[in-house]
């Protein structure tokens, strides 16, 4: 009988230990959840405040309407210029309207004067059609003045108020474009 009682007591003690362990685990889990919650809230807070403080365009970029523009300070060939823009989360400039062209040429006059700047325009070798890098056609008023007699690939660039064409392997400055951040706060 005594042996039976001590066996029951041992089982109860074992049960108690298991329950204590479970409680300890639960407390630990609860604490971890609270910490994660705190971290999440802090992260959300930071994200919201940085979004609130962030300007529509990065530093050294120029804003016009929904676009941000970056005027390079280095020369490169057309293809490398495109890759340089992609590294900044942008593409070579795509001019959609005369108003945008006027803004660009006006800004360039203020910044640098009369240099050559690659834009995202190239001439298809087979058809001879001019196309922007996303595959769309330029509006009739924004076709490059024929200047290049190159047998190589021909790309578009801006100089003063004009859109011109040149061998894509020549070195020029370039202009990148990305969409401005919309303020959602």
């Amino acid at each position: 009988k005594l042996l039976q009682v001590s066996t029951i007591a041992m089982q109860q003690q074992e049960k108690l230990i298991q329950q204590e362990r479970a409680l300890l685990n639960f407390t630990e889990w609860k604490r971890s959840c609270a910490l994660q919650m705190k971290y999440c809230q802090a992260f959300m807070q930071n994200s919201l405040s940085s979004a609130h403080n962030s300007s529509p365009c990065p530093n050294n970029w120029i804003q016009n309407r929904e676009s941000c523009y970056y005027v390079s300070e280095i020369w490169s060939i057309w293809h490398t210029s495109q890759e340089n823009c992609l590294k900044e989360g942008s593409t070579l400039l795509q001019i959609e309207s005369k108003e945008e062209m006027d803004f660009i040429t006006g800004s360039l006059r203020k910044i640098k004067g009369s240099y050559d700047y690659w834009v995202g325009l190239s001439q298809d070798g087979h058809s001879g059609r001019w196309l922007w890098q996303d595959g769309s056609s330029p509006s009739p008023g924004l076709l490059p003045a024929e200047r290049s007699q190159s047998a190589n690939q021909v790309c578009g660039y801006v100089k003063s108020n004009s859109l011109l064409s040149s061998n894509c392997s020549t070195w020029k400055y370039f202009i990148c474009e990305k969409y401005a951040l919309r303020s959602s706060v």
């Epitope: 890759e83 992609l86 590294k87 900044e88 989360g89 942008s90 593409t91 795509q94 890098q133 996303d134 474009e177 990305k178 969409y179």
Partner: nanobody, 118 residues
Framework: QVQLQESGGGLVQPGGSLRLSCAAI????????MGWYRQAPGKQRELVAA?????????TYADSVKGRFTISRDNAKNTVYLQMNSLQPEDTAVYYC??????????WGQGTQVTVSS
């Protein structure tokens, strides 16, 4: 560190279609744009198409693929796709996925073979 895993390559007849996928695994916060390059035997690696990572994305295509190839992305899956239609023998190459990064080395995938032949 980010790993880029390409898939979807294979053998296709001229005029056929293929869709390549590039899944980015790891901390992709630093990636500013994703691109597809290709390299045919004895030729230089060339940019085929790219898409920027911002919510309002911008795209760029090589002249030779405009109107035939379309680049897109699924942010939820961290995956970029290249839909290739009207494939021609000259599209035969190893296609590589690239993750562009500002002020740092870019990430490259291992490549997937695309062969266009009858």
């Amino acid at each position: 560190q980010v790993q880029l895993q390409e898939s979807g390559g294979g053998l296709v007849q001229p005029g056929g279609s293929l869709r390549l996928s590039c899944a980015a695994i790891g901390n992709i916060a630093s990636i500013t744009a994703m691109g597809w390059y290709r390299q045919a035997p004895g030729k230089q690696r060339e940019l085929v198409a790219a898409i920027t990572s911002a919510s309002a994305s911008r795209t760029t295509y090589a002249d030779s693929v405009k109107g035939r190839f379309t680049i897109s992305r699924d942010n939820a899956k961290n995956t970029v796709y290249l839909q290739m239609n009207s494939l021609q023998p000259e599209d035969t190459a190893v296609y590589y996925c690239k993750g562009f990064r500002s002020g740092a080395d870019d990430y490259w995938g291992q490549g997937t073979q695309v062969t266009v032949s009858s």
